[in-house]
């Protein structure tokens, strides 16, 4: 679609005569008829296939024609067309004399024609005017012409329609050749696709307007480049959404099980060495002189009653010292200077001489012991504490301090490792002699059933159109992360289909 424009500039008819040679009375009141048609090698009469236009009376005999385009007038003359400009044309311009005010062909005398010119040729679409002058024996016509495209039409033949827009269907202006030029912030064939915030992750982010960055499920951050870990993940991170990869020292599905109790809690006292031995479990190795589960108890070296023959024990910083009764000597008062004549046996013990009276031996009644029957029987000597329990004399009684995992008066009872429900996700716990064992339900594994081994919901490739599939660990279902231009739970719907789509 376009317009053929004809600008009449000057008409000369000095003698004021008609084509027949007859003079006009009182002068030639001149108007023009224009016929535009398809190219003809020899321009002949017939339909004006591209259009016609007539002017009012523009002057008498010789006159210049004012450019009237700015004032909404009729110069240049407009010949609009609604087809692809073919690049060639034929043009007929007739100058007529109007004796009266009626310019209709049928109202004019047959010899009212002043002059007639016919031209033909090639004409490309463009802004530049082509200047021409045609002379006959009596007249001269100077004019210029051009072809320009109508509003919203572009290209060499005015065949390309382009209407600038800034709405849901596109955001663009039109280039001189009719191609689209996207407005800032938009891209794509029809400039419908917003340019997201610079750096917005190509797969994990998207936008509905320019400079925006909206995150797809499982992603977060200004540029949607940070994954969201599994809900409830305590001491872990992710590299893809819904993961929970545990930090060092933590375990379990949610990384909430402490595997490094020693570092996190420092339970061992008095310079003891701590060793991790499982979830929330540890062992303290005490320095000499300390005992207890956490090495919190100071050990007295006199507790083992090292002094013999009634010697009394004194604790010292670097050990102990025995104070021997009369007649005894040695580190533990183990050497005697007595004989049976000195009645050395206490608590009803009977004395037997040895080595021709050089020394003796006491035979003690029940409940007494020692080389002189001076000691009550130490209830710990028979090592009554089972399972590695530590025996402690407490006056007339004794007690057993049990190792972790044992209880009872003599540490004879095995504490059930299953009592604290160590098996995750409904695993069944079995007590064993040296620990426990978990039998895991389907979908879980690991020493404590803490590892999820459920089926991969993405294995069946449920997502279409190059979408990324993620498994939601909490529901064992898939989540499809759609690329731009596709929607639906499986990214199965394109938001637009090209006009050439084979319906």
């Amino acid at each position: 679609s376009g317009v053929f424009q004809l600008q009449l500039q000057e008409f000369i008819n000095e003698r004021g005569v008609l084509a027949s040679g007859r003079p006009c009375e009182p002068g030639c009141r001149t108007f023009f008829r224009v016929c535009l048609k398809h190219f003809q090698a020899v321009v002949s009469p017939g339909p004006c296939t591209f259009g016609t236009v007539s002017t009012p009376v523009l002057g008498t005999n010789s006159f210049a024609v004012r450019d009237d385009s700015s004032g909404g007038g009729r110069n240049p003359l407009q010949l609009p067309f609604n087809f692809t400009w073919p690049g060639t044309f034929s043009l007929i311009i007739e100058a007529w004399h109007a004796p009266g005010d009626d310019l209709r062909p049928e109202a004019l005398p047959p010899d009212a024609l002043i002059s007639k010119i016919a031209i033909q040729g090639s004409l490309a679409v463009g802004q530049n005017w082509l200047l021409d002058e045609q002379t006959s024996t009596l007249t001269r016509l100077r004019y210029s012409y051009r072809v320009i495209c109508s509003d919203n039409y572009y290209g060499d033949n005015c065949s390309r329609l382009c209407k600038k827009r800034n709405d849901h269907f596109g955001h663009y202006v039109c280039q001189p050749d009719g191609n689209l030029s996207c407005l800032p912030g938009w891209t794509g064939e029809y400039c419908q696709q917003p340019i997201c915030l610079s750096g917005c992750h190509e797969q994990n982010g998207y936008c509905s307007k320019p400079a925006e960055c909206l995150c797809r499920p499982g992603w977060q951050g200004r540029l949607c480049n940070e994954c969201i870990p599994h809900n409830g993940c305590r001491h872990g991170t992710c590299s893809t959404p819904w993961q929970c990869t545990c930090d060092e020292g933590w375990g379990g599905l949610f990384c909430d099980q402490d595997l490094n109790y020693c570092t996190h809690h420092s339970p061992c006292k008095n310079g003891a060495t701590c060793s991790n031995s499982g979830q929330r479990s540890y062992t303290c190795t005490c320095r000499p002189g300390y005992t207890g589960v956490d090495c919190e108890l100071e050990l007295s070296e006199c507790d083992s009653n090292p002094c013999r023959n009634g010697g009394s024990c004194k604790d010292q910083e670097d050990g102990y010292h025995c104070l021997c009764p009369p007649g005894y000597y040695g580190l533990h008062c183990e050497h005697s200077t007595l004989s049976c004549a000195d009645s050395p046996c206490f608590n009803g013990g009977s004395c037997r001489e040895r080595n021709q009276g050089a020394n003796y031996a006491c035979e003690c009644p029940p409940n007494f012991t020692g080389s002189n029957c001076e000691k009550k029987v130490d209830r710990c000597t028979s090592n009554p504490c089972a399972n590695g329990g530590q025996c402690l004399n407490r006056g007339p009684s004794r007690m057993c301090r049990c190792r972790p995992g044992f209880t009872g008066t003599y540490c004879e009872l095995h504490v059930s490792d299953c009592a604290r429900n160590p098996c995750a996700h409904g695993g069944t716990c079995h007590d064993l002699e040296n620990g426990l064992m978990c039998t895991c339900p389907a979908g879980f594994s690991g020493r404590r059933c803490e590892v999820r081994t459920s089926i991969d919901a993405c294995a069946s490739s449920p997502c279409f159109n190059r979408a990324t599939c993620y498994t939601d660990l909490s529901t064992d279902t898939f989540v499809c992360n759609c690329p731009y231009g596709f929607v639906g739970s499986r990214c199965e719907f394109p938001v637009g289909l090209p006009p050439s789509f084979p319906w």
Epitope: S460, S461, P462, F464, V487, G488, S489, R490, E492, F493
Partner: nanobody
Framework: EVQLVESGGGLVQAGGSLRLSCAAS????????MGWYRHQAPGKQRELVA????????HYADSVKGRFTISRDNAKNTMYLQMNSLKPEDTAVYYC?????????????WGQGTQVTVSS
């Protein structure tokens, strides 16, 4: 092979309402993903108006959000598009589309289309 038949199109004044229906053949209708596309002019792309996936999740084009509602009745093997507050720019041929799924593929089926004309 799935057959789709649309109905409910017609001429309506701006601000008025229409309800489009799409009846589908096939015994596994509830597992189909279904959508409405529209074609507004020759040479323009066919544009997704609304879609409902087999899991029931819905999606709408920005231009119709809040005005159009997509739904399905699995017992009647029919999908609907309730169109309220219609505008002249909603004038188009509306096509019903369904997708039937295999293990990792789907087949596309289209109806013949129903004309909706909104006059101002």
């Amino acid at each position: 092979e799935v057959q789709l038949v649309e109905s409910g199109g017609g001429l309506v004044q701006a601000g008025g309402s229409l309800r489009l229906s799409c009846a589908a053949s096939g015994s596994t209708f509830s597992s189909y993903a279904m959508g409405w596309y529209r074609h507004q002019a020759p040479g323009k792309q066919r544009e997704l108006v609304a879609a409902i996936s087999s899991d029931g999740s819905t999606h709408y084009a920005d231009s119709v959000k809040g005005r159009f509602t997509i739904s399905r009745d699995n017992a009647k093997n029919t999908m609907y598009l309730q169109m309220n507050s219609l505008k002249p720019e909603d004038t188009a041929v509306y096509y019903c589309n369904t997708k039937t799924f295999g293990s990792n593929w789907y087949d596309d089926y289209w109806g013949q289309g129903t004309q909706v004309t909104v006059s101002s």
